[in-house]
């Protein structure tokens, strides 16, 4: 008898009653497996359930496939042994007899697996599409809600204006929009959503309460509030919205009148610095991050804003890569690659009268309030708003001039009634936009302060001389820690030393201006500058401490600025005639530090504590300060430029070159210290009372150097 398969473990041997078992056993098992997929219907519920069911089915099929392949392998072996003349036992023979069946099953299982895999992919695609659709819908809803909040805050803000109140009471065509009681209700509600600073509460707690009120209003809840319900208040507010009162022409829109825009357009060409710096390497790498820039579109001259572009009214995130690239390709003077002490020395400037005239021209061109988002909306600590979901617009590539780094905010009184000792106010003071091209990766560590509004009347909270004090820059500390990562930098909240002011200005050397990040890229037209000595600066309106990685081998001499001449004016522009508004970048990132881009230290003006009724000019900018975690808190911090930061990338932050990436936005450390106040709009001049007792804090309460715990 041929040598049997007795030793080959694969076979099953049956000489006695050799079992036809192979088939019976294993086939049965296979059958059971095969049945499994049928019973595992893909769940029709949520995507997750479907995916899970599909996984299970695929798992069963996969297991079945493996079993069949294993079995087929055995059968092949049996057959081979049979061919060699070896005897198989009954189980093996039974198995071999099932060879065709196993082969067919295997093919079927493979086909089944392919089908289910395709189905699984389809399901995944569908789930992703659905999720994306849902996400978009959620974002849309969030956006709508945010828009509503902004509208609501705008309306509530506007109700501080007597003229608006009167108009709403009289109504359009004699039909009143709001009654006196309804106005009072809204006034009461305003106090809840725009509360006076309560020092017994942490800021985020206070705004948490405020946000709950806003939320309940948006929901139109039946809960009682201010002697009525949120639902009633919502109806009142909706009535105001529907009246379209604020859409009509008597409203002072943010931006320039047409003739002003037309007049300011030529200024663009003149804005390009005529200095001849060695251009740094252009940074042209396309940013992969969908970034968002904050641009006050209405603030641009018409020639600069390409009206042909689709206005992205409802799109909140806008790719600005092309813009960024086009801006980055402007020649930039390379700054010396050695970190220098933060001292700025004076630069001879043109005739004071000429300079003053220039500034006034500049201000005249930039009339009109900014219609920016309330800071309360930006207090992300207790809200689920995505920081990227804030009205954004790409900058127009044609705007490649550097923007002035100064703000000339008007003075706002604490109450709606004019204060006797206010500094004279130009009714239409202007703001020049600040450029923010900073990174979170590196945070310059100058001491940070909360500069108070220079002329704001704060009832005996602090002496006016201290308010107007210029805060000197602590150079030692800055230099020492400038190359430290944000987390390791000291947080400094110290009152600035009082120095005599030149022309009531705030010294641009002051730490808040140098180390705080500015908020918006507002592409405002800037008047032409003709003085050659002024234009010889690296960039006329460059970010202070223009930190750049330059590939330039030699150091470029930085023009020195006189400390006295670096003053940004508070209130109306009282700057001495020789002020230059220029902060030349001479603080460089040390070349060896390439772990994160330095925070561009830009002048920063705190214009938040504007009380209602003041001149509206200063609404545009939002302040920030450093909290205990050394994270910059305030105005939209969290912009991360997505650029290569190699030392020779030639990236200078003064040009609007960094696309903003919100991916790393740490919401939890972010708190706005100030909400912007809403001064009275446009050329209405003096603050208005609200009829009856003054509501001192309809704008924002003043808070100075308050550290949030």
């Amino acid at each position: 008898m041929p040598s049997a398969t007795s030793h080959s473990g694969s076979g099953s041997k049956s000489s006695g009653p050799p079992p036809p078992s192979g088939s019976s056993g294993s086939e049965a098992a296979a059958g059971a497996g095969a049945a499994a997929p049928a019973s595992q219907h893909p769940a029709t519920g949520t995507g997750a359930v479907q995916t899970e069911a599909m996984k299970q089915i695929l798992g069963v099929i996969d297991k079945k496939l493996r079993n069949l392949e294993k079995k087929k392998g055995k059968l092949d072996d049996y057959q081979e042994r049979m061919n060699k003349g070896e005897r198989l036992n009954q189980d093996q023979l039974d198995a071999v007899s099932k060879y065709q069946e196993v082969t067919n099953n295997l093919e079927f299982a493979k086909e089944l697996q392919r089908s289910f895999m395709a189905l699984s992919q389809d399901i995944q695609k569908t789930i992703k599409k659905t999720a994306r659709r849902e996400q978009l819908m959620r974002e849309e809803a969030e956006q709508k809600r945010l828009k509503t909040v902004l509208e609501l805050q705008y309306v509530l803000d506007k109700l501080g204006d007597d003229e608006v109140r009167t108009d709403l009471k009289q109504g359009l065509n004699g039909v009143p929009i709001l009654s006196e009681e309804e106005l009072s209700l809204l006034d009461e509600f305003y106090k809840l959503v725009d509360p006076e600073r309560d020092m017994s509460l942490r800021l985020n707690e206070q705004y948490e309460h405020a946000s709950i009120h806003l939320w309940d209003l948006l929901e139109g809840k039946e809960k009682p509030v201010c002697g009525t319900t949120y639902k009633v208040l919502k109806e009142i507010v909706e009535r105001v919205f529907q009246s379209n009162y604020f859409d009509s022409t008597h409203n002072h829109q943010n931006g320039l009148c047409e003739e002003e825009e037309a007049a300011s357009a030529p200024a663009v060409e003149d804005q390009v610095p005529e200095a001849e710096p060695e251009p740094a390497e252009e940074y042209t790498e396309q940013s992969e991050v969908e970034s968002t820039e904050y641009v006050n579109r209405q603030f641009m001259a018409e020639t600069q804003f390409t009206s042909g572009e689709k206005e992205q009214v409802d799109e909140w995130t806008v790719e600005t890569v092309e813009v960024v690239n086009s801006l980055q390709q402007q020649p930039q003077a390379a700054s010396p690659s050695v970190p220098e002490p933060h001292s700025l020395t004076p630069v001879a400037q043109a005739d004071p009268l000429v300079r003053r005239q220039r500034v006034q021209d500049l201000m005249a061109q930039m009339q009109g309030p900014y219609n920016f988002i309330q800071d309360s909306m930006l207090d992300f600590e207790n809200q689920t708003l995505d920081p990227a979901i804030v009205s954004a617009q790409p900058m127009n590539p044609t705007q490649n001039m550097d923007m002035p780094q100064l703000v000339c905010p008007p003075v706002h009184s604490e109450s709606r009634l004019a204060q006797p000792n206010q500094v004279p106010v130009q009714p239409e003071a202007t703001q020049v936009p600040l450029v923010s091209s900073t990174s979170e990766g590196y945070t310059a560590s100058q001491p940070l302060y909360q500069p108070s509004h220079a002329t704001e009347q704060r009832p005996q909270k602090e002496p006016i001389d201290q308010i107007q004090a210029t805060i000197s820059l602590n150079t030692d500390q800055t230099t020492a820690s400038s190359s430290l990562p944000a987390a390791s930098q000291p947080q400094v909240f110290q009152a600035g030393t009082s120095k005599p002011l030149h022309s009531s200005g705030i010294n641009v050397n002051a730490a808040p201006f140098q180390s705080m990040q500015t908020v918006f890229n507002m592409n405002a037209p800037v008047p032409p500058v003709n003085e050659p000595e002024t234009l010889k600066q690296q960039n006329q309106y460059q970010a202070s401490y223009n930190q750049s990685f330059s590939s330039q081998p030699h150091q470029v001499e930085q023009t020195e600025l006189q400390q006295e001449q670096l003053q940004t004016v508070v209130g109306t522009y009282h700057g001495s005639p020789d002020q230059s508004h220029q902060v030349t970048g001479n603080h460089q990132q040390p070349p060896q530090q390439n772990t994160g881009f330095p925070r561009s230290n830009q002048p920063y003006y705190n214009s938040r504590g504007v009380s209602r009724g003041g001149s509206r000019g200063a609404r545009g900018l939002m302040n920030g300060y450093r909290g205990p975690a050394n994270g910059f808190r305030g105005g939209y911090d969290g912009y991360r430029p997505s650029f290569s930061n190699t030392p020779n990338s030639g990236y200078t932050q003064s040009q609007f070159s960094a696309p903003r990436d919100y991916s790393g936005y740490q919401r939890d450390g972010y708190q706005q210290n100030f909400k912007r106040g809403s001064g009275q709009s446009g050329p209405r001049g003096a603050p208005r009372g609200r009829g009856g007792p003054p509501r001192p804090n309809r704008g924002m309460p003043q808070m100075n150097t308050q550290q949030v715990n």
Partner: antibody
Framework: EVQLVESGGGLVQPGGSLRLSCAAS?????????MSWVRQAPGKGLEWIAY????????AYANWAKGRFTISKDNSKNTLYLQMNSLRAEDTAVYFC??????WGPGTLVTVSS | DIQMTQSPSSLSASVGDRVTIKCQAS??????LAWYQQKPGKAPKRLIY???NLDSGVPSRFSGSGSGTDFTFTISSLQPEDIATYYC??????????????FGGGTKVEIK
């Protein structure tokens, strides 16, 4: 229905002979099967006797069965046989035929007694 | 001939108990082993083939393991209908090295 039915059992005197048959239905003897005979004495365990491979007629026997017992098949009749000679009292048992070791007949009783 | 030794020859257990039966071959038979259940007056019924493969229709409380010379049969949770005698059998094809399809002596399982 696939089944096996044994026949030919009964009372036989010691030293006598008996031929057991196992009729297969539901399947053909032309397949690849081992057909076996197994017996079980009253109150005792199972005891394998012999098998034949239907395909080529190869046989194997338990040592104790060699010489006295012969396994055979008739493909045309689909029948398996067990020829028992020189029966002894200890051969008294129920005799089962089996296809492989999965399918069994109900058995037929063989009693060897004088 | 190959010899199969089964132990214990009988056992008594309670319903729900785990029951284990051993079978030892006189020489290595790889995994060529089957386990049978036989109830009085009936033909044996194969439960396990190739040492560990469960026949179709057999409850999963029955299982087999082992290879070479030592094999184990287990009833994970004894049920009243499991009262029977259990046998092991070498199922190798007879050859010069392994001869015969010998059965073990059987194990009678009873309920306490």
């Amino acid at each position: 229905e696939v089944q096996l039915v044994e026949s030919g059992g009964g009372l036989v005197q010691p030293g006598g002979s008996l031929r057991l048959s196992c009729a297969a239905s539901g399947f053909s003897f032309s397949g690849s099967y081992y057909m076996s005979w197994v017996r079980q004495a009253p109150g005792k365990g199972l005891e394998w006797i012999a098998y034949i491979y239907i395909g080529d007629g190869v046989t194997a026997y338990a040592n104790w069965a060699k010489g006295r017992f012969t396994i055979s098949k008739d493909n045309s009749k689909n029948t398996l046989y067990l020829q028992m000679n020189s029966l002894r009292a200890e051969d008294t048992a129920v005799y089962f035929c089996a296809r492989g070791n999965k399918l069994w007949g109900p058995g037929t009783l063989v009693t060897v007694s004088s | 001939d190959i010899q199969m030794t089964q132990s214990p020859s009988s056992l008594s257990a309670s319903v729900g108990d785990r029951v284990t039966i051993k079978c030892q071959a006189s020489q290595s038979i790889s995994s060529y082993l089957a386990w049978y259940q036989q109830k009085p007056g009936k033909a044996p019924k194969r439960l396990i083939y190739d040492a560990s493969n469960l026949d179709s229709g057999v409850p999963s409380r029955f299982s087999g393991s082992g290879s070479g010379t030592d094999f184990t049969f287990t009833i994970s949770s004894l049920q009243p209908e499991d009262i029977a005698t259990y046998y092991c059998q070498c199922t190798a094809v007879s050859s010069a090295t392994i001869y015969g399809n010998a059965f073990g002596g059987g194990t009678k399982v009873e309920i306490k």
